[in-house]
Each structure stands twice: as C-alpha cells, then as structure tokens.
C-alpha cells in the first residue's frame, strides 16, 4: 500500500514543500450508495482518520518514490447494518511541521471518490486510484463485529456452549461452525434476510425493504402479474416459476413481469436494467486516472466516465493491457507506452497497426509507369523501359542486357532502345535472318547468342505499336 507519484507523470515530487518536513494523514469517509446529499455532506456511514503517521523530510526536487502508508489499519466503525453498496472517499492530507511552516498547516493533497459494492466478511479488495499527479494504492474490506455475522452484519451469533451442538431450537451459524445463531430478540416474523434489530421486539429494514417485518420491497404497493398476497403480509407470491424469481433487481428494486421478461422499478438514485448503477453523480468525482465524467441530461441521472486511452472500467479504475487485444496485424510486435500504443512491424508491412502489406499491389504503386504484378504472396514491379529497381525508381541502361541479337549494335534512346543490325539480319532485335533468295525471314538463334527475353521482347513490341 502506498501513496506516491503515478507512472509517466513527470519528475516524482515529495509531498512536502520547501517549508520543511511534513506528514501525511488519510481521512476515510463512507457515504450511503443512494446518498442524495451534496459532495461535502456528512459521512453518514462513518469516517476515520489514520494514526501513527511517518514524517517525510524530502524537499522539492528530490526524488520521491512511493511513500509507505501509515502503519496499521484505518478502521471506520459503521452504524446499523452494512448496506453493501456505498461510496468510499479517501482524502490525503498534508500537515506541515516545524517552526517556520508558515501558511496553512493543513493541505488537501488528493481526494478520490468511488462507488463500491462489498459484502461484509469477504476478502480484501485491492484498488489503485490516481488523482492529480498522485497514485494511491489501497485495500479495503468490511467486517462484522461479534456477535453480528452475514453479508449485512444483520444476523447475530454467539459462541457454542458445547463443541458439538447448539442450544435447543438454534441452528449453527454459517459460516462460523463454532458459533450458533443468537436467540431471537427481534420482533417475531422479522425477515432474517432483510431485517435486523438492536433492541428486543424491534424490526429494522435493510436498504430497499419496508413493512413491519421488512418483507415488502420498496416501491411495491400491490401484487402484479398473477402474483397473490402472501400469508401474514409477507409480500407477493408467484404460483409457478417466473422471470422475477429470486428478484433479479438489485439495491431494493422491485421486479415486475413484462411479456416473458422482467422490468425493475428502481429506488431513487439507482439505475440500469437491474438497478445495478448507483446514484453517485459527477459532482462526486467518480472518474479516476484522468477520466472525464459525462453526466446524464438531468442532475439525477447516472454518469458515464470517458476514460483516457489505457484505462477502462465504469470509473476508469482499471489499467488496460491493450496489447492483449492483439491490435498489431501481420505478426507485428505490440508496445504499450502508456500514453500510446505502438506496433513494430515485420519486414514488408507498415502502418500504425501494420495493416499495410508492402508486398501487396494495393499497398503501393510502381513508379515511372511500371506495372505491379502479384504472385506467390509477394509483389514485384514490371518496369517500363529505361527504369528498374524494386519500385521502378532507378534509371536503367536499356542496352545493359545486350538485347540486339546477331551482333547488332544497341543505341539507348529516350523512348527505349534501337538496334542497328549487322548485314543479313533485321527485326526490332535483329532476330530475323534475311534469306538471299527472297524467302521469308525466319527467326534465328545461333548457338552462343542469347535470344531476347520474351517479356522484354513483348513489352518492347507492345511499346513500339503505341
């Protein structure tokens, strides 16, 4: 767990300024998940300040690595039952020490806010938040104080009197095999799932439930869609299995059937298909790591965080391994630089994602009137006369291949080449021997002389007919 400069955010800075040593405190504040209060409102679920704080003596300009958090836990006692959904606010405060501190002794360095869902008794949840240029690593969990147990700390347990069994009429207390459910002190019939009590004959309801025995979901005024009232006003029952069985609506939402599916009527401050989105607004600063909070059209509607490249999650709280999405095509090597993604392309490929195949005719044209020819997974340029090289960019000597047969002399010309044939031969490449008796000229390829490259011959022939 640490609080320190975030990665890629310039020179690490000390939390202290030039006025001498300082120490950091952490204020943890818990607010209800459906809080309609302002950002600066009371921490209705509880608050606590860290203790046993180390003193930092670095000055600006000195490198400051991640700073150790204060020793020991920050314990935030919460009243009533644990709601499960809540807003967690962590503030990092700096206290300036020394005689020459001057100015305000306390400064708020950073403040992170996020909505969270957490059952009591679960493992530590880890988190990393960035705000300004600081990065805070922390873990949190919710724990019930004995004799309370359960995800909401709403059930009471006590140690077994005998190792083997609980008292008459009392069940073992899961998940604690050595404990038993405490004798019922709540109002008889008080829902064990949705109700709890702190005084005898009392029945307090968890968030989202109402009624004298906490059996009626909030916003449910009557039974809908073939549901019938249950015994002793315990809610509504469904004759057979249906889409609302098990109530898919979270956070106290009430479920109603709609043409084979279901619809959730959410309590104020919750949104989404299953009322899973809590009512934290942009004013709470829920978007981390540079995320921008985009609110709904009205102040009560849910927010969306637009995350900078490299982060994701409803609060931009998760760093993305963008290379795991394999964005580089054609075997390119992916490099995630934090602020940008780079692809190092294999030979023959180019483009930001190595998407351009340089060995593909669509990728690049041949220069100087050359023609692109594909074949065997690669491409080559068939160059116009007078040009050569991979892309026909090099000037070629048309006579270099000795194209004139039978001792003909080659002359380079701006449009190609001209062969001056030896006596007794004719043709574009001096390829025809002239018969003295007036018979037709026939192609001749005497031994020891190279016949013209057919491709060159055809190309040249084609050229001359234009």
């Amino acid at each position: 767990h640490s609080f320190g400069p975030g990665p890629g955010l310039g020179t690490p800075r000390s939390p202290c300024n030039a006025r001498g040593p300082c120490r950091l405190f952490f204020r943890v504040c818990l607010k209800p998940g459906v809080s309609q209060e302002a950002t600066e409102s009371l921490c209705a679920l509880g608050a606590a300040l860290s203790t046993s704080v180390p003193v930092y003596t670095e000055h600006p300009g000195e490198s400051a690595a991640a700073l150790p958090l204060p020793d020991g836990l920050v314990r935030v006692p919460f009243r009533d039952a644990w709601p499960g959904t809540f807003s967690l606010v962590i503030e990092t405060w700096r206290e300036q020490l020394g005689e020459h501190a001057g100015g305000p002794a306390w400064n708020l360095l950073a403040r992170v806010v996020g909505r969270r869902r957490l059952a009591a008794g679960g493992p530590w949840a880890r988190d990393v938040q960035r705000t300004g240029t600081w990065e805070l690593h922390f873990s949190y969990r919710a724990r019930c104080e004995p004799p309370a147990v359960g995800a909401a700390c709403a059930r009471l347990c006590r140690s077994r009197s005998a190792p083997s069994r609980c008292g008459p009429g009392l069940r073992p207390c899961t998940p604690f095999p050595d404990e038993c459910e405490a004798p019922s002190v709540c109002r008889p019939g008080c829902s064990p799932e949705h109700g709890y009590c702190e005084e005898p004959d009392e029945c307090r309801c968890l968030e989202g439930w109402t009624g004298p025995l906490c059996t009626v979901p909030v916003s449910t005024s009557s039974c809908l869609n073939s549901r019938v009232p249950g015994p002793a006003s315990t809610g509504c029952l469904l004759p057979g299995p249906g889409p609302c069985d098990g109530n898919p609506c979270a956070n106290g939402g009430s479920c109603s059937e709609t043409s084979g599916s279901f619809e959730c009527a959410c309590p104020r401050g919750f949104y989404g298909l299953r009322c899973e989105v809590s009512g934290v607004t942009c004013a709470d600063g829920p978007c981390f790591n540079g995320g921008l909070c985009v609110g709904g059209e009205d102040p009560d509607s849910a927010y969306v965080c637009h995350c900078p490249p490299g982060f994701q999650g409803s609060n931009c709280e998760k760093r993305v391994d963008r290379c795991s999405l394999q964005p580089c095509q054609n075997g390119g090597l992916c490099l995630d630089l934090g602020h940008a993604l780079r692809c190092r392309c294999r030979a023959g490929f180019a483009g930001p994602r190595c998407e351009h195949d340089l060995d593909d005719c669509a990728g690049r044209a041949c220069a100087n009137g050359g023609t692109c020819v594909e074949g065997g997974g690669s491409r080559r340029c068939s160059c116009a006369l007078g040009f050569g090289g991979r892309d026909c960019r090099e000037r070629a000597d048309p006579c270099a291949s000795r194209p004139c047969a039978h001792g003909g002399r080659c002359y380079a010309h701006f449009s190609g080449l001209v062969c001056a044939c030896a006596p007794g031969y004719m043709g574009v490449r001096c390829e025809f021997a002239v018969r003295p008796d007036g018979a037709d000229a026939v192609p001749a390829a005497p031994r020891g002389l190279r016949q013209a490259d057919p491709q060159r011959f055809l190309h040249h022939h084609h050229h001359h007919h234009h």
């Epitope: 890629g8 955010l9 950002t39 600066e40 950073a110 403040r111 992170v112 806010v113 705000t131 300004g132 240029t133 942009c282 004013a283 709470d284 600063g285 829920p286 978007c287 981390f288 790591n289 540079g290 921008l292 909070c293 985009v294 609110g295 637009h306 900078p308 490249p309 490299g310 934090g338 602020h339 940008a340 993604l341 483009g351 930001p352 994602r353």
Partner: antibody, heavy 118, light 108 residues
C-alpha cells in the same frame, strides 16, 4: 513531434454548413482523443466536441444539435461539421489533441479563421 | 456546467515581478482536473499545467500551479518578456469541458 493542420473554407454563408478537416502528421490518430475548440475574435475559448477512434464522441450541449464530429483513420484526419451557421459562429477554429492523461489539450493546430457572411 | 471565473481580467506588471492569477469554479473541480494555458497574439494556446499543479513537457519551472476544490492559482515567479500573454484555465473533470474567460498579463 506531431503536428495538426486545419483546412476548410474561410468564408461560409449564413444558414449553410461549415466543414473543417484536421490532418494529423503522424499515425497516432488511434492512440488519442481528438477535439475541436473555437475562439471568437477578441473572446475566450469554447470547447466544441471530441472523438476517439473507437467511436466515442462527446459534444458541448450548447452546440450538440448542430455539430457532427467524425474521424478517418486511413487518412489520419478528423472533421467537424457545424450546420445552420450564423454570425455568432465566426471564430478561429482550432483542432487539438487530447492529453494522454486527462481531457486537457496538449497539441494544437495553428487555427483557421472562419467568417460567416452572405 | 462548471463555470470558471478568472481574476483579475488584466494584470499589469513589470518583467522580473511575480504574477498570481486566480481561477474560481462554480462547483468543485473533481480530482483537481484543472489545466492552465498560455496564448500569445495570433497563436494557438499552449498547455502549461495539468492536474492543477503538474507542469507540461518543456514548461519552465517559473510556472507553478496550486489549488483544489473550487480555487486554483497559477503563479509565474519571475516574469520574462515572453510571458506577457493571455492565460486561460480549463476544467476537465466534468462534461462539458469549460474554459475561464482569461487573464491578460501586460507590461506595466
């Protein structure tokens, strides 16, 4: 370092649509958000919209009904269209790159002046 | 939307003096997501500060930013001739992104 270049007509008639394009000098268009900001003569800056290659867009509510922003990764360009322009839309229009850590603007084009007149 | 009010509108100082510019927000700027820009006549703005207090690449250390919540300050410890310009603050915590009206720092 990457450079941005705005292009488009400097004169638009009232009620017509203003179209501007910003060309990004390198291949980084898929790595950042890209934005348009304007500044009427002698006045302050007003953010118009931004876009990300994934399709994410966001518009200033005061202009949302008239603005469209789009992006073409193959050309390394992004564009702005502002419909039904009036004299109040006359301004220097800047394209800008959104900073990699937060929605500030770290690289700006030099700006293009748009006049609205018949 | 968050309205940013900059003061003073104009600041008349001499080279070598210290300049203190204020930016006040109508609501809390979340996570100190506030930036400062400098704009010279006929030029595009230049990012100076982000995250309320972090200098952008290549910005001299005479520029510093501070503040949180609704009150933010840009300080130029010792004015150089090239620092006489218009300065804008911008919040990027909540959409829409908004700019302050600007403070002009002029030579006295």
């Amino acid at each position: 370092q990457v450079q941005l270049q705005e292009s488009g007509p400097g004169l638009v008639k009232p009620s017509e649509t203003l179209s501007l394009t910003c060309t990004v000098s390198d291949n980084s268009i898929s790595n950042y958000y890209w934005s348009w900001i304007r500044q009427p003569p002698g006045k302050g800056l007003e953010w118009i919209a931004y876009i990300y290659y994934s399709g994410t867009t966001n518009y200033n509510p005061s202009l949302k009904s008239r603005v469209t922003i789009s992006l073409d990764t193959s050309k390394n360009q992004f564009s702005l269209q502002l419909s039904s322009v009036t004299a109040a839309d006359a301004a220097v229009y800047y394209c800008a790159r959104v900073f990699h850590w937060g929605f500030a603007f770290d690289i700006w084009g030099q700006g293009t002046m748009v006049t609205v007149s018949s | 939307e968050i309205v940013l009010t900059q003061s003073p509108g104009t600041l008349s100082l001499s080279p070598g003096e210290r300049a203190t510019l204020s930016c006040r927000a109508s609501q809390r700027v979340s996570n100190t997501y506030l930036a400062w820009y400098q704009q010279n006549p006929g030029q595009a703005p230049r990012l100076l500060i982000y995250g309320a207090s972090s200098r952008a690449t290549g910005i001299p250390d005479r520029f510093s930013g501070s503040g949180s919540g609704t009150d933010f300050t840009l300080t130029i410890s010792r004015l150089e001739p090239e620092d006489f310009a218009v300065y804008y603050c911008q919040q990027y915590g909540t959409s829409p992104l908004t700019f302050g009206g600007g403070t002009k720092v002029e030579i006295k």
